[in-house]
């Protein structure tokens, strides 16, 4: 199988000059490193910081949304070390960790006004911040937290370079004081969990301090990553010595503590994944160990399996796993070793980004009970990493996509099997981002974000789809690269889409490309299952072409067919007339066959033999409609592009088009009737349909009242016409 390659879909969208200047001002000092990350929230933000300067940009356009230069209490300006998106009381902002010569400061920054609205001092050097909750009080929405935490209003976990873990009260119930980062509040650290939290909090707040609970006192080992996993209600804490701890936010106790397989290498990132319908209540946590830019060269992914006693759905609709029974490492992937053949000796490998993407099936497709906790039917983790190779100016950048449900399907191996590489693995897909590096060099890539909504597998080439269709290498998605100078958009296409694009580009020379095109379609899983066990050499070129045309129609890749037709008509190559005749005949035969299949499927709708349609039959009918619709478009292309054709040929062509158009409309009407419950036609339908399907007076009254309301609200300015 060939390598998948990302395509750049935009030029560099540069940050405004003012942003570049502000960030560049501090790059001259040694400690000031330019950091940049996409914010994980839904607001489309990217945050960049260098020294005391913070720049917040639109992650799609690169335009400046907010900026701030932090001040300190002495001549040495503070350094922005940690930034996390945070929303509270209908406001969007950031939690920011500043390092000063003496300790740190936690700031609540309001993006709407580009100001710090709250600040509190912290001990030591903050290494990460993670919001736990953005409100407080003993409401239903805080019942998953320890009773002591429920008295606080907004909680952020803060960790330091000496291993301290603090849960800080953000005091969001008191936004009266007009603070900034210089005039930050004091902090009172509680080591145990006292009974009188409300009383203590009140007294502490009266003294102008914030309360905080210390989960772990300083150990001397830096915390390298921090993540709150809402679905398991755990705070995942990764340490610089390769240990990972899980703290339960209900009991405020440590549930798990272990050193990962790669030993004393910092745990650089964690991300959560949930499989589809695991009966044992298992979910997963990826822990990434990475040396990043420091000595050594380690980048390894560790998949931890967390098994819980209970999985429930809260009133809010949120899923919650409870009662951790065990946690163990189930899969390891070393991205620095020879997992995929690299030319040359690597000198440094570092993680650029990792994220998890979940998609839930739309409610209409669900079979579960209403109160059952739903699991995602798509669950993938995306890792992007950079490999620097000795003697090569440009680094290599890769994007890997792990599909946990396909890993289950592959019987949960603990690592790549011998002889198996990332680019031919059934649960892991690999894209090369070489084109991005070429276009953006010498600008360094800071982060890469895959757009969740763009992730799709495309249209199945047949029903049931072939096995390859489910592999992660069939995913298509868009992503954005955050650089030190702007943003760049890219698209990653799976084997199927890539194969169809290849065929589309092959154009008039299709005849020479049929064998190769057929093989590509076969490998990509685009052909009907009946071709899987057939030797390509035993098929004629016509049969192979028919298979390719079927793949194009099934996957709605109509540009492929209409492109061929237009080119053959205009370019008049030696084989053009033969090709056109062949495709027209094939299209019409396909219409006839699909109509026969459609009629066969619809018999039970009309003969009174069934009272409801099973989902499979409905899906098959819809598939027939889609095919008829696609074939109609192809015939329409023939009809509109036809030239130098006899009168009889033109009539024949237009008849074919009209007939296919009518069949298409008929199929549409049948589908509408079955969706509306008017089909299938039962024996006792006359009883059911004694009244109108639509209650006219009710609808009339509703719309009349709505019109009156609009008129009232607009004070006569609303024109109903």
């Amino acid at each position: 199988m060939r390598d998948l390659r990302a395509q750049v879909t935009s030029g560099l969208l540069p940050f405004p000059e003012v942003t570049l200047q502000a960030l560049g001002e501090d790059e001259i000092t040694l400690e000031s490193v330019l950091r940049g990350k996409f914010a994980a929230g839904k607001n489309g933000l990217a945050c960049l910081a260098c020294g005391p300067q913070l720049e917040v940009v639109n992650s799609i356009t690169g335009e400046r949304l907010s900026a701030y230069r932090f001040s300190g209490v002495n001549e040495q300006p503070p350094v922005v070390l940690a930034v996390k998106e945070f929303s509270w009381q209908k406001r969007t902002g950031l939690l920011i960790g500043l390092e000063e010569t003496e300790g740190s400061v936690l700031c609540l920054y309001d993006l709407g006004i580009s100001k710090v609205v709250k600040a509190v001092v912290l001990p030591g050097r903050v290494t990460a911040i993670e919001p736990i909750i953005n409100h407080g009080g003993a409401s239903a929405s805080t019942q998953h937290l320890h009773p002591s935490l429920r008295w606080l209003f907004g909680v952020a976990a803060v960790v330091t370079d000496v291993g301290q873990i603090l849960l800080v009260d953000l005091c969001l119930d008191d936004l009266s004081c007009n603070q900034n980062e210089v005039e930050a509040s004091d902090l009172e650290v509680l080591t145990g969990i006292p009974a009188e939290v409300p009383h203590i909090r009140e007294s502490v707040m009266r003294q102008g301090r914030h309360l905080c609970f210390q989960l772990v006192s300083p150990t001397g080992t830096a915390v390298s990553t921090l993540s709150y996993i809402s679905r398991t209600n755990q705070l995942a804490v990764g340490f610089s010595d390769g240990y990972l701890a899980l703290w339960n936010m209900k009991s405020m106790k440590r549930e798990y503590y272990i050193q990962l397989e790669s030993g004393q290498v910092p745990v650089y990132a964690v991300t959560f994944q949930e499989p589809e319908n695991d009966p044992r209540n298992c979910c997963y946590l990826w822990a990434v160990q990475s040396t990043q830019d420091s000595e050594g060269d380690v980048l390894s992914l560790h998949l931890l399996q967390l098994a819980f006693g209970n999985r429930k759905c809260l009133a809010s609709g949120q899923i919650l796993y409870e009662g951790l029974e065990y946690c163990e490492e189930r899969y390891t992937l070393d991205l620095t070793g020879g997992m995929f053949p690299l030319r040359g000796q690597t000198s440094n490998t570092k993680l650029l980004g990792c994220q998890s993407i979940e998609k839930f099936r739309s409610h209409g497709d669900r079979e579960e009970g209403v109160n059952e906790a739903l699991s995602p039917d798509t669950s993938v983790s995306v890792f992007t990493w950079q490999v620097n190779i000795y003697g090569q100016g440009k680094p290599s950048v890769y994007l890997g996509l792990f599909d946990i449900n396909r890993w289950y399907h592959a019987q949960m191996p603990d690592s790549l099997r011998s002889g198996e590489y990332l680019h031919n693995c059934s649960y892991f897909a690999l894209w090369s981002l070489e084109s991005v590096v070429s276009r953006t060099s010498p600008h360094g890539i800071l982060d890469i974000l895959v757009h969740e909504r763009s992730l799709n597998r495309g249209v199945p080439p047949s029903y049931p789809p072939p096995e390859q269709f489910f592999n992660p290498s069939t995913y298509n998605f868009d992503a954005t690269c955050l650089l030190n100078s702007g943003v760049v958009h890219l698209t990653c296409t799976g084997f199927q889409k890539e194969t169809l694009t290849f065929l589309k580009k092959s154009g008039p020379s299709l005849n020479e490309l049929i064998p190769d095109g057929y093989n590509r379609c076969l490998v990509a899983g685009l052909l009907s299952p009946r071709f899987v066990d057939v030797q390509p050499s035993s098929l004629s070129q016509e049969e192979q072409l028919e298979a390719i045309l079927s793949a194009a129609i099934q996957t709605s890749s109509l540009g492929l067919l209409t492109g061929y037709i237009r080119r053959w008509i205009t370019e008049e190559q030696p084989n053009s007339a033969t090709n056109l005749r062949f495709v027209l005949e094939w299209t019409w035969n396909k219409v006839v066959l699909t109509k026969e299949e459609f009629d066969r499927l619809c018999v039970p709708l009309f003969d009174g033999s069934c009272h409801f349609m099973d989902p499979q039959t409905i899906q098959s009918i819809q598939q027939c409609y889609l095919l008829l619709s696609n074939l109609n478009i192809v015939l329409s292309c023939f009809a509109s592009e036809a030239r130098e054709i006899t009168e009889r040929g033109l009539i024949d062509l237009s008849n074919k088009f009209v007939v296919s158009h009518l069949i298409c409309q008929y199929a549409q009407v049948v589908l509408w009737f079955s969706h509306s419950g008017l089909l299938p036609e039962g024996i006792d339908d006359s009883v059911q349909l004694s009244r109108l399907c639509y209650n006219y007076p009710v609808i009339q009254n509703y719309y009349t009242s709505r019109r009156q309301k609009f008129e009232r609200l607009s004070r006569g300015k609303w024109n109903p016409d």
Epitope: V73, N74, V105, V121, L122, N178, V189, Q207
Partner: nanobody
Framework: QVQLVESGGGLVQPGGSLRLSCAYS????????LSWIRQPPGRGLEWVSK????????AYADSVKGRFTVSRDNAKNTVYLQMNDLQFEDTALYYC?????????????????RGQGTQVTVSS
């Protein structure tokens, strides 16, 4: 940048009084409070008192409650600590401080900014 300068320390007999001053700059005390902390010989830092940003409120450690009073003069950008009925255990280096992290016993774990300190010695 924030600057804090303490003065007013000295040698005093038990039961005597002293008034410490802290001249501050680079700060808006309507937004934040200033604390007095101290370091007894051979011991760590401990919190003494704090004047809150609203000016009228103050907080004190149990060990000095009723004996020490904190106040401020906005026009002079100065905070005062009036210490009465001084005891031997009040002997310490006193600092005016901003941005404290402390535990529930009043032990100061870290200080964001403080002056050079002024020595108070209670001795007979």
């Amino acid at each position: 940048q924030v600057q804090l300068v303490e003065s007013g320390g000295g040698l005093v007999q038990p039961g005597g009084s002293l008034r410490l001053s802290c001249a501050y700059s680079g700060l808006d005390l309507s937004r934040v409070g200033l604390s007095w902390i101290r370091q007894p010989p051979g011991r760590g830092l401990e919190w003494v008192s704090k004047i809150l940003n609203n000016g009228s409120n103050a907080a004190y450690a149990d060990s000095v409650k009723g004996r020490f009073t904190v106040s401020r003069d906005n026009a002079k950008n100065t905070v005062y600590l009036q210490m009465n009925d001084l005891q031997f255990e009040d002997t310490a280096l006193y600092y005016c401080a901003l941005g404290l992290v402390q535990d529930s016993q009043g032990v100061v774990l870290s200080v964001r900014a403080r002056g050079q300190g002024t020595q108070v010695t209670v001795s007979s």
